[in-house]
C-alpha cells in the first residue's frame, strides 16, 4: 500500500508517457489520475514500467473499478495483466475474442499461469460452449489446452470445433479424453472420403471402438505403429490377425519391436499361434494349437 502524499509541483501527469518511468512509487500514486490511466491504458504497455511501478498503477485501477475492470480497460492491460490475481479476473466479464487474444499474447511463450487459466475459464463459461474460433485461438497459444480439460468440459465442445484441432493438440490427452473427442471427430469428418478421413481422424483414434477399427482395416489405411500403440487395448483385443495386418499394411512388421508392450502384448496373447505365424514376424505367446478358448465373460452373461 502506497501512502497518500501530495503531488510535487509540476509533476502532475497530463498523459501516460515514458517520462513516468522516472517517477518514484509515491509520485506515481500522487501524480497519476486513475481515470486518465484508464483511458490511456494502451500506452502503458509501450513503456518499460518496473514490477513495483505496475503495482501502483494496478492499485489505482482497483480503486477506480472495485467491482472489476470494464472490457475497454481489460483489452489494453498488456503486461499489467500479469499482475492480476485469479480473484481479480473472476470479477471480469470478457466477451470479445480480441480481448482474449490480446491478453494471451502477453503470456506467449510461457506456460499457462493461474491467471490465464482463470481468464480462459471465465471466457468459455461466458460463451456457453467452446466454439471453433475460441478453440482455434486457445490451441494456437497453448497446444496442450484441450488435454487440460476434463471429459465433462470436453463434452461441451461442438463437433464443428474439432476442425480447429491439430495432431499436436492431442499429444497429452489420456484415453478418457479421447473417448469424448473421438465421436465428435467422427461426426465432424463423416463427409470426407477414405484417405482424407483417415488423415483427419488418425490423432483421435485413441478413443475408437473395435467396430470402427474393423471398418478402417477394410480401407487400406496403412496405420503407423505410433498410432496403433495409442489405441485402446479393449478395442484392439477382438481384432483378428488378418484385420490387424490389413489395418497396418506395410507397417505390420513393426509389431515385432513392440511385442512386449501394450496393446500388442495383450493382443498377441489372444491370438492363435498359427495365425500369428502367418505374419512371418516370429511373434510368440499366442494360444497353442489344439487349445480351446473360452470367453468367460460371455458365459457369465448367459448364466
Amino acid at each position: 500500500e502506497v501512502e497518500k502524499t501530495a503531488c510535487p509541483s509540476g509533476k502532475k501527469a497530463r498523459e501516460i508517457d515514458e517520462s513516468l518511468i522516472f517517477y518514484k512509487k509515491w509520485e506515481l500514486e500522487a501524480c497519476v489520475d486513475a481515470a486518465l490511466l484508464a483511458t490511456q491504458m494502451d500506452r502503458v504497455n509501450a513503456i518499460p514500467f518496473t514490477y513495483e511501478q505496475l503495482d501502483v498503477l494496478k492499485h489505482k485501477l482497483d480503486e477506480l473499478y472495485p467491482q472489476g475492470y470494464p472490457e475497454s480497460v481489460i483489452q489494453h492491460l498488456g503486461y499489467l495483466f500479469l499482475k492480476m490475481s485469479p480473484e481479480d479476473i473472476r470479477k471480469w466479464n470478457v466477451t470479445s475474442l480480441e480481448t482474449l487474444k490480446a491478453l494471451l499474447e502477453v503470456n506467449k511463450g510461457h506456460e499457462m499461469s493461474p491467471q490465464v487459466a482463470t481468464l480462459i475459464d471465465r471466457f468459455v463459461k461466458g460463451r456457453g460452449q467452446l466454439d471453433k474460433d475460441t478453440l482455434d485461438t486457445l490451441t494456437a497459444f497453448y497446444p496442450g489446452y484441450l488435454c487440460s480439460l476434463s471429459p465433462e468440459e470436453l463434452s461441451s465442445v461442438p463437433p464443428s470445433s474439432i476442425w480447429a484441432v491439430r495432431p499436436q493438440d492431442l499429444d497429452t490427452c489420456d484415453p478418457r479424453q479421447l473417448d469424448v473427442l473421438y465421436p465428435k471427430a467422427r461426426l465432424a469428418f463423416q463427409n470426407m472420403n477414405g484417405s482424407e478421413y483417415f488423415v483427419k481422424i488418425q490423432s483421435f483414434l485413441g478413443g475408437a471402438p473395435t467396430e470402427d477399427l474393423k471398418a478402417l482395416s477394410q480401407q487400406n489405411v496403412s496405420m503407423d505403429l505410433a498410432t496403433f500403440m495409442k489405441l485402446r487395448t479393449d478395442a484392439v483385443l477382438p481384432l483378428t490377425v488378418a484385420e490387424v495386418q490389413k489395418l497396418l499394411g506395410p507397417h505390420v512388421e513393426g509389431l515385432k519391436a513392440e511385442e512386449r508392450h501394450r496393446p500388442v502384448r495383450d493382443w498377441i496373447l489372444r491370438q492363435r499361434q498359427d495365425d500369428l505365424d502367418t505374419l512371418g514376424l516370429g511373434l510368440q505367446g499366442g494360444i497353442p494349437n489344439g487349445y480351446l478358448v473360452l470367453d468367460l465373460s460371455m458365459q457369465e452373461a448367459l448364466s
Epitope: P48, Y51, L82, V106, N107
Partner: nanobody
Framework: VQLVESGGGLVQPGGSLRLSCAAS????????VAWYRQAPGEQREPVAA???????IYADSVKGRFTISRDNAKNTVYLQMNSLKPEDTAVYYC??????????WGQGTSVTVS
C-alpha cells in the same frame, strides 16, 4: 527469459563504454526496454528507456552523454556511455517486457569510473 549484460569495465573519467544486453527469444524487438543502474547502497534506478514505438528518454543526470539503441535482428539493446563521470559508477542492468514485469533480472555488468 535470459538477459545477459556485457561491456562494463574500469574506465577513466571522460572515457567511454558501450554496454550490450542480449535476450533470449524476440523480447527486445517487440517490447519497451530500459537500462537501469544500481550504485553501492542505492536503489536500482532507470537511466535510459526506449518505448516499443522507438522513442527514447533519459534521466536528467545522463542526458546528452548516454544513448540507448537496439538491434532487433540481434535481439540486443545497447547503451553508449560517453563523458563518463565517477558518479556513473554502478552495476548496469537492462530489462523489458515479460521479465521486467515478473521482476526477473540478469547479472548486470559493472562499470567503474575512476
Amino acid at each position: 527469459v535470459q538477459l545477459v549484460e556485457s561491456g562494463g569495465g574500469l574506465v577513466q573519467p571522460g572515457g567511454s563504454l558501450r554496454l550490450s544486453c542480449a535476450a533470449s527469444g524476440s523480447m527486445f524487438s517487440i517490447n519497451a526496454v530500459a537500462w537501469y543502474r544500481q550504485a553501492p547502497g542505492e536503489q536500482r534506478e532507470p537511466v535510459a528507456a526506449m518505448t516499443s514505438g522507438g522513442s527514447t528518454i533519459y534521466a536528467d543526470s545522463v542526458k546528452g552523454r548516454f544513448t540507448i539503441s537496439r538491434d532487433n535482428a540481434k535481439n540486443t539493446v545497447y547503451l553508449q556511455m560517453n563523458s563518463l563521470k565517477p558518479e556513473d559508477t554502478a552495476v548496469y542492468y537492462c530489462n523489458g517486457g515479460w521479465s521486467l514485469v515478473m521482476d526477473y533480472w540478469g547479472q548486470g555488468t559493472s562499470v567503474t569510473v575512476s
